[in-house]
Interface confidence: low
């Protein structure tokens, strides 16, 4: 493929290969400038598969902290307001790059790690399995 | 709190301070072993706000593609299969983590960077805003 | 209206190589991913590979990896495949393709052939 | 890699439904998108449903596309058969990396 070429002022890396371990500055830039999380916050809510957020923390995780969404009724909530177990709310769930300490307990020293997490929940039309 | 001590095996860091550069190994572990991507796979067309995938590529960032959700219209779905506009479609948003190359071309120097993805769609009742 | 012109195909012998260029009009060349397919006589269709909008990412058919090069020049709104170490089953038509999203071949040139035979 | 299995060749009479199938061999074909591509012969092939069900402007209504999770397989349906409708019938599905056709089904409106 098209290869862009390397920067002369990158800093130097004794192992070229991949995978590798490399610089990160944890500084973190937000590109979200933009965005208004207020426009977003109360989804969970009005949601016709409402959902709860949890908390789940490790020290030892960068960041420490993620928020989990767990649907609040196995199935969706009609015009009425009542459950209509017809129908079904299921987690979106999405893979993040996270960073894990490697060794443990090491300020300076992380190794990427995919996790999974469910984001919200959307209400979909269930699988129907028909007996032959 | 509790003070985990420093590991004594841990890579020597000029700096001590937050934010600090750090070394990530990008070989990355994947925690998702137990998970089945077949069950969340197809929510997208079966939701009652059903959205579109679409690829986002960035060759300056790591994870350099990442899918976009766009929702397929502005209301949902309702029983008979139609468009319900008393319903709104709306995106789940998440914050995510990524590493940007920094410099720019870099393979070996990366800063975090937070950006704003939306993982899916999700059907809310919507806010009326009534006219005095 | 979306127009794709494929040039650069003929007989070639194996081993040899050849350039294929697609001339682009009636879009934004560089806000779309590209695509080559191949079709065999009388056979099936056959993804070949694939480059993102700003030429930054490179996609391959494992049949083609190390021999094949697709490149693009925004500028000339072309899209180019470098063939080299050519083989007999190489031999098809040749169509460049514009991405409605990755992997969904939205609109297709007319196609250019390449033959390889001694 | 995966692989997508089409009947070799389907026939109907005018004014009647067929409806063609794909199956993937391996992988959940609910993951990505299928699409699917009319080719006459001696033309370049052309799209005819993309995102499993979605048609672009200008083909009729009389073709629709669907895909059943349970058998890892979608499917092209053409109602109203027309005579212009034969012509070879390509799905076609994709990971991150590769895109994949199946292998083509031939329609004879009888």
């Known amino acids: 493929g098209i290869t862009i070429p390397r920067n002369p002022g990158c800093p130097n890396s004794e192992d070229k290969n991949f995978p590798r371990t490399v610089m990160v500055n944890l500084n973190i830039h937000n590109r979200n400038t933009n965005t208004n999380p207020k426009r977003s916050s109360d989804y969970y809510n009005r949601s016709t598969s409402p959902w709860n957020l949890h908390r789940n923390e490790d020290p030892e995780r960068y960041p420490s902290v993620i928020w989990e969404a767990k649907c609040r009724h196995l199935g969706c909530i009609n015009a009425d307001g009542n459950v209509d177990y017809h129908m079904n709310s299921v987690p979106i769930q999405q893979e993040i790059l996270v960073l894990r300490r490697e060794p443990p307990h090491c300020p300076n020293s992380f190794r990427l790690e995919k996790i999974l997490v469910s984001v919200g929940c959307t209400c979909v039309t269930p699988i129907v399995h028909h007996v032959a | 709190g509790i003070t985990i001590p420093r590991n004594p095996g841990c890579p020597n860091s000029e700096d001590k301070n937050f934010p600090r550069t750090v070394m990530v190994n990008l070989n990355i572990h994947n925690r998702n072993t137990n998970t089945n991507p077949k069950r969340s796979s197809d929510y997208y067309n079966r939701s009652t706000s059903p959205w579109n995938l679409h690829r986002n590529e960035d060759p300056e960032r790591y994870p350099s593609v990442i899918w976009e959700a766009k929702c397929r219209h502005l209301g949902c779905i309702n029983a008979d299969g139609n468009v319900d506009y008393h319903m709104n479609s709306v995106p789940i948003q998440q914050e995510i983590l990524v590493l940007r190359r920094e410099p720019p071309h870099c393979p070996n120097s990366f800063r975090l960077e937070k950006i704003l993805v939306s993982v899916g769609c999700t059907c809310v009742t919507p806010i009326v805003h009534h006219v005095a | 209206e979306v127009q794709l012109l494929e040039s650069g195909g003929g007989l070639v012998q194996p081993g040899g190589s050849l350039r294929l260029s697609c001339a682009a009009s009636?879009?934004?060349?560089?806000?779309?991913?590209m695509s080559w397919v191949r079709q065999a006589p009388g056979k099936g269709l056959e993804w070949v590979s694939a480059?993102?909008?700003?030429?930054?990412?490179?996609y391959y058919a494992d049949s083609v990896k190390g021999r094949f090069t697709i490149s693009r020049d925004n500028s000339k709104n072309t899209l180019y495949l470098q063939m080299n170490s050519l083989r007999a089953e190489d031999t098809a038509v040749y169509y460049c393709?514009?991405?409605?999203?990755?992997?969904?071949?939205?609109?297709w040139g007319q196609g250019t052939m390449v033959t390889v035979s001694s | 890699n995966f692989m997508l299995t089409q009947p070799h060749s389907v026939s109907e009479s005018p004014g009647k439904t067929v409806t063609i199938s794909c199956t993937r061999s391996?992988?959940?074909?609910?993951?990505?998108?299928v699409q699917w591509y009319q080719q006459r012969p001696g033309s370049a092939p052309t799209i005819v449903i993309f995102?499993?069900?979605?048609?672009p402007s200008g083909v009729p209504d009389r073709f629709s596309g669907s895909i059943d999770s349970s058998s890892n397989s979608a499917s092209l349906t053409i109602s109203r058969l027309k005579t212009e409708d034969e012509a070879d019938y390509y799905c076609?599905?994709?990971?991150?990396?590769?895109?994949?056709f199946g292998g083509g089904t031939k329609l004879t409106v009888l």
């Open positions: 995102a499993n069900n979605q048609r």
């Open positions: 393709a514009r991405d409605l999203i990755w992997g969904v071949a939205g609109s």
């Open positions: 480059i993102s909008g700003s030429g930054g990412s490179t």
């Open positions: 009636g879009f934004t060349f560089s806000s779309y991913a």
């Open positions: 391996s992988g959940s074909l609910a993951n990505y998108y």
């Open positions: 076609q599905t994709y990971d991150p990396y590769s895109v994949v």
